[in-house]
């Protein structure tokens, strides 16, 4: 049996849409299947890797690095995006290409990113993981560190940084995939929200649906513990 | 309101050692991404720039004069100072010191500048 | 080093005229960057990035250019315009300026 619940939520362009949350019932009436998962069932993604899942993270991984900041011209925000998602005429899409990226680091002028940009997050901004010496950031941006600590300013000059950010990862379903939405949208989803996150490659979201101990390497399932939990 | 102004001796002899500092105010230089740059100028000519150091200590020259040139900080004393050894007339110029700011740049530029400093090389 | 060569050296210009200031550099670059100055004067950004106008600055100023052709338009000379600009490139180490181009009042 499915339970379904709709509702008007915000979503990713600012605007309120009819949502639908589909939530598989438990036939025996008890606890939702992320339930019975956080409890741990015997659930094989949380014991060993899947393939089916592997293949979804890397496809939304290769997605990711494609994508840029898309920030609104009316100044109410920015979101990341894939450029096709990303209005021509109401928006300004923030990517990188060529010669317009910033140069790897301060030591390297000539090579210039191509990878980004990421709304809300900068390598030439964030203190901390500072990009510089033996630990700048790739040019890829789904091997960026979250940024815990940002250059004190108010004000960047940089489009993608100095927008309201509406959007961050959201771990959504059973199957860890994450989504790039408002904090509004991923708690109707009953997803988890990584508020400390910009892209979904700084998330494991596998990790969050499984609970428990967390994995020794977030990208590698190990509780075959499970065998004996349930 | 950011300022820097640049002191040092308006004179000095061939063969001696020039030492210029730059004091500032309005910025610290251990704020994340701040620099603070050398530039000069010889009577009627252009611009060339000398050396700069960044907020983590990381320094940079112009490699043609790069054996000459040191480029120091005092954080606490919101200063920076140039040393330039075996000073020629050639070197006769103004020097200035500029931050560096990359406010909305891919790069950096040099945003504020002292009123510069003239310095002869005269025997 | 890369190269800056500016034309022309030096230009006579009325007030109201438009004028254009070109910057070639010896290799490619991705970003030029512009300076005035006035006698006496330490130089002051107009433009950074090819097209960005520094704070402060008039929107008589514009920059545009890639690769190796630069330029610096004003698009209606003001009295206060008369001085001496400057090209800068921060591609590679070292920085290099061009030798200035003077502009003066005809």
């Known amino acids: 049996a499915q339970h379904v619940t709709t509702q008007l939520v915000l979503r990713n362009k600012g605007v309120y849409e009819s949502v639908k949350y589909i939530q598989q019932e438990n036939f025996w009436i008890g606890p939702s299947s992320i339930d019975l998962i956080h409890l741990g069932a015997k659930f094989s993604p949380c014991i060993r890797k899947d393939q089916q899942i592997e293949q979804l993270v890397l496809r939304e991984r290769d997605l990711e690095r494609d994508s840029g900041c898309c920030v609104q011209n009316d100044h109410s925000g920015c979101i990341q995006t894939q450029r096709k998602d990303c209005s021509e005429t109401l928006a300004t899409f923030v990517k990188w290409q060529d010669d317009t990226g910033p140069p790897m680091d301060k030591s390297d002028l000539g090579q210039k990113r191509t990878s980004g940009a990421v709304c809300h997050q900068d390598p030439r901004t964030c203190e901390e993981p500072a990009s510089s010496g033996a630990h700048i950031w790739p040019d890829d941006i789904t091997k960026w560190p979250i940024c815990t600590e940002q250059a004190k300013s108010n004000r960047t000059g940089f489009l993608h940084m100095d927008c309201q950010i509406k959007g961050r990862p959201c771990c959504i379903s059973t199957k860890g995939s994450c989504e790039i939405t408002t904090r509004e949208y991923c708690e109707f989803m009953h997803g988890y929200f990584h508020e400390e996150a910009t892209l979904c490659s700084q998330v494991h979201c596998l990790d969050k649906v499984c609970g428990l101990l967390p994995f020794l390497n977030p990208e590698v399932p190990d509780q075959f513990y499970r065998l004996w939990l349930s | 309101q950011v300022t820097l102004r640049e002191s040092g001796p308006a004179l000095v002899k061939p063969t001696q050692t020039l030492t210029l500092t730059c004091t500032f105010s309005?910025?610290?230089?251990?704020?994340?991404?701040?620099?603070v740059g050398w530039i000069r100028q010889p009577p009627g000519k252009a611009l060339e720039w000398l050396a700069h150091?960044?907020?983590?200590?990381?320094?940079y020259y112009n490699s043609a004069l790069k054996s000459r040139l040191t480029i120091s900080k005092d954080t606490s004393k919101n200063q920076v100072v140039l040393t330039i050894t075996n000073m020629d007339p050639v070197d006769t110029a103004t020097y200035y010191c500029?931050?560096?700011?990359?406010?909305?740049?891919?790069?950096?530029?040099?945003?504020?500048w002292g009123q510069g400093t003239l310095v002869t090389v005269s025997s | 080093a890369i190269q800056l060569t500016q034309s022309p050296s030096s230009l006579s210009a009325s007030v109201g005229d438009r004028v254009t200031i070109t910057c070639r550099a010896s290799s490619r670059i991705s970003y030029m960057f512009w300076y005035q100055q006035k006698p006496g004067k330490a130089p002051k950004v107009l433009i950074y990035?090819?097209?960005n106008l520094a704070s402060g600055v008039p929107s008589r100023f514009s920059g545009s250019g890639s690769g190796t052709d630069y330029t610096l338009t004003i698009s209606s000379l003001q009295p206060e315009d008369f001085a001496t600009y400057y090209c800068?490139?921060?591609?590679?180490?070292?920085?290099?300026f061009g030798q200035g181009t003077k502009l003066e009042i005809k």
């Open positions: 800068q490139q921060w591609n590679s180490y070292p920085l290099t």
């Open positions: 990035d090819t097209s």
């Open positions: 500029a931050r560096i700011q990359n406010y909305g740049s891919n790069y950096w530029y040099f945003d504020v």
């Open positions: 309005g910025f610290s230089l251990s704020t994340f991404g701040r620099g």
């Open positions: 150091i960044w907020w983590d200590d990381e320094k």
